[in-house]
């Protein structure tokens, strides 16, 4: 990651991505540590501050403006040198988003996945957008950039990722950009969370009374395992959003969480999965599918299949 | 959103030290800087100095340095100002706001008043 | 150090007029300077920065001009909520300077 033997490294935290009025910290690493450095721009525009001014460890940038955007490097202090400066550090790339209007962006086929499967992320917009990009949150690394393709009045382009493991699930948005400004983009799509299931031992789902109840009769599914999972998720097919509850551990050494369904309307069938708190996007295996079928209920609408969203905060911590 | 809480008002006497914090919210402090600002009656607002939050370097106005000092709790969030041999010229509101080395201060805290008087 | 110069204590307007603020630096700061707005009893507030970039949730009825080393901020129809002191900062070169402030009052 370093540079080399005279050339420094320069890097953003948190993110090259950055949004308009926000801020971001640019170190310039040299020599094994953070010294004195100066920074430059370089298509020279905007930051006047910049010229002759020195800076220590790191350098603070913002509120960003669209006119931050571009291409950084630094150089570090080399005292006994001819000029006194190293030669210049990688080229970094700050990209300002909240420029145009948001794109969308979609799962092909879903977004909850078996481990080594591969998904599309689909970012589209009626926006003439010359590129898209697409950002996994907490990921410091610049986003991956496609050219897009227009058809019928909409811009898009096709990203695939995968074979899946855990290192790739998160929580993802794509953005685009305009020709002649490529790194001013656009506001983030709505996030999408990409989980990867099938990494850990299936959890057990059981129905209190039982799996075939009276309509108007209370149900509550339960999630156990022997494993020490945080959260436990709770799908019913067809339907687009899944509950989630923190795991208790039990005197029998389990971890459960019990789901209130309340009064039974209509059956279905429900799967549950564990997720350790500190990768709430990876997921057990399912555990085995639960039909509940509801009796003296003969008019009960079933719900139309839609596909999962996964736009509800899934990869953020249960507090 | 984002919020800056600092201290209470403070009343010393001359030769004391005072120490003020500001609570920041709403963002990664780690990611921007804190700008301290002093305003009195007679010269209005003075820029004391600046603590990057990142790096842990503090920079000190010229007027403002040695007995003004900054520091950080990063796992609380929150930035101090510390005051040392306390004068009747030090009496005033102190501001803490949000921001980086280009200067600009985009969130305020709500002020903190120090009165230094025998 | 940098001086920010606002000649004008004080501004009188009356509801829907259009209100200039003008600020001189002793130098010429290449664009980095920013407007806020101190209400009685409360803190400042960014209004402005780079000369003419609004802060987020900023009306738009504020607008920032100027060059070299002479700067405005103009508030294109008053608002009774707009009775405030504002100030311009130059954040070209450390150490950052203020103006003395400009009152608003409205007539």
């Known amino acids: 990651l370093m540079g080399g033997q005279d050339k420094p490294f320069l890097s953003a935290r948190p993110s090259t991505v950055v949004p308009r009025g926000g801020h971001v910290a640019l170190q310039c690493h040299y020599r094994r540590g953070f010294n004195n450095f100066m920074l430059y721009k370089e298509d020279r525009s905007h930051v006047p501050i910049f010229h002759g001014r020195i800076f220590q460890e790191s350098f603070i940038m913002g509120p960003v403006t669209p006119a931050h955007a571009g291409t950084y490097r630094c150089r570090g202090s080399r005292p006994h040198s001819l000029t006194g400066w190293s030669a210049p550090s990688n080229p970094l790339v700050i990209m300002v988003t909240g420029n145009h209007r948001k794109p969308s962006l979609l799962a092909h086929p879903g977004p909850l996945l078996k481990s080594g499967e591969t998904v599309i992320l689909q970012c589209w917009s009626d926006v003439m957008f010359e590129h898209f990009f697409l950002h996994r949150e907490g990921i410091s690394e610049d986003p991956s950039r496609l050219v897009g393709q227009i058809h019928d009045g909409v811009s898009k382009a096709n990203f695939s990722i995968g074979p899946l493991m855990p290192v790739l699930a998160g929580t993802y948005r794509c953005y685009g950009s305009v020709p002649h400004s490529p790194y001013q983009l656009s506001a983030p799509s709505d996030p999408l969370d990409i989980v990867i299931t099938g990494l850990y031992e299936k959890p057990s789902l059981s129905a209190q009374p039982g799996p075939t109840v009276q309509a108007g009769e209370n149900v509550t599914l339960s999630c156990s395992s022997w494993s020490s999972y945080d959260i436990y998720h709770l799908s019913r097919e067809g339907e687009a959003h899944e509950r989630r509850l923190r795991a208790v551990p039990k005197v029998n050494r389990t971890f459960q969480a019990d789901f209130p369904l309340g009064p039974a309307t209509h059956g279905g069938t429900y799967r549950c999965f564990g997720s350790f708190r500190a990768l709430p996007c990876v997921w057990s295996n399912s555990s085995d599918p639960l039909l509940v079928s509801v009796t003296g209920n003969p008019s009960s609408s079933w719900p139309s299949p839609t596909e999962p969203s996964s736009k509800s905060g899934i990869c953020r911590h249960l507090h | 959103q984002i919020q800056l809480v600092q201290s209470g008002s403070e009343l010393k006497k001359p030769g004391a030290s005072v120490k003020v914090s500001c609570k920041a919210s709403?963002?990664?402090?780690?990611?921007?800087?804190m700008q301290w600002v002093q305003k009195t009656p007679g010269k209005g607002l003075e820029w004391i100095g600046w603590i990057n939050s990142h790096s842990g370097v503090p920079k000190y106005a010229e007027d403002f340095k040695g007995r003004f000092a900054f520091s950080l709790d990063t796992s609380a969030s929150t930035a101090y100002l510390q005051i040392s041999s306390l004068k009747a010229e030090d009496t005033a509101v102190y501001f803490c706001a949000r921001g980086g080395d280009e200067g600009v201060m985009d969130y305020w805290g709500q002020g903190t008043s120090v009165t230094v008087s025998s | 150090d940098i001086v920010m110069t606002q000649s004008h204590k004080f501004l009188s307007a009356s509801v829907g007029d259009r209100v200039t603020f003008t600020c001189k630096a002793s130098?010429?700061?290449?664009?980095?300077v920013a407007w806020y707005q101190q209400k009685p009893g409360q803190s400042p507030k960014l209004l402005i920065y780079?000369?003419?970039t609004r802060h987020t949730g900023v009306p738009d009825r504020f607008s920032g001009s100027g060059s070299g080393t002479d700067y405005t901020l103009t508030i294109s129809s008053v608002q009774a909520e707009d009775v405030a002191v504002y100030y311009c900062?130059?954040?070209?070169?450390?150490?950052?300077?203020f103006g003395g402030g400009t009152k608003l009052e409205i007539k």
């Open positions: 900062q130059q954040h070209y070169s450390t150490p950052w300077t």
């Open positions: 709403g963002y990664t402090f780690t990611t921007a800087g």
């Open positions: 780079w000369t003419s």
């Open positions: 130098q010429d700061v290449s664009t980095a």
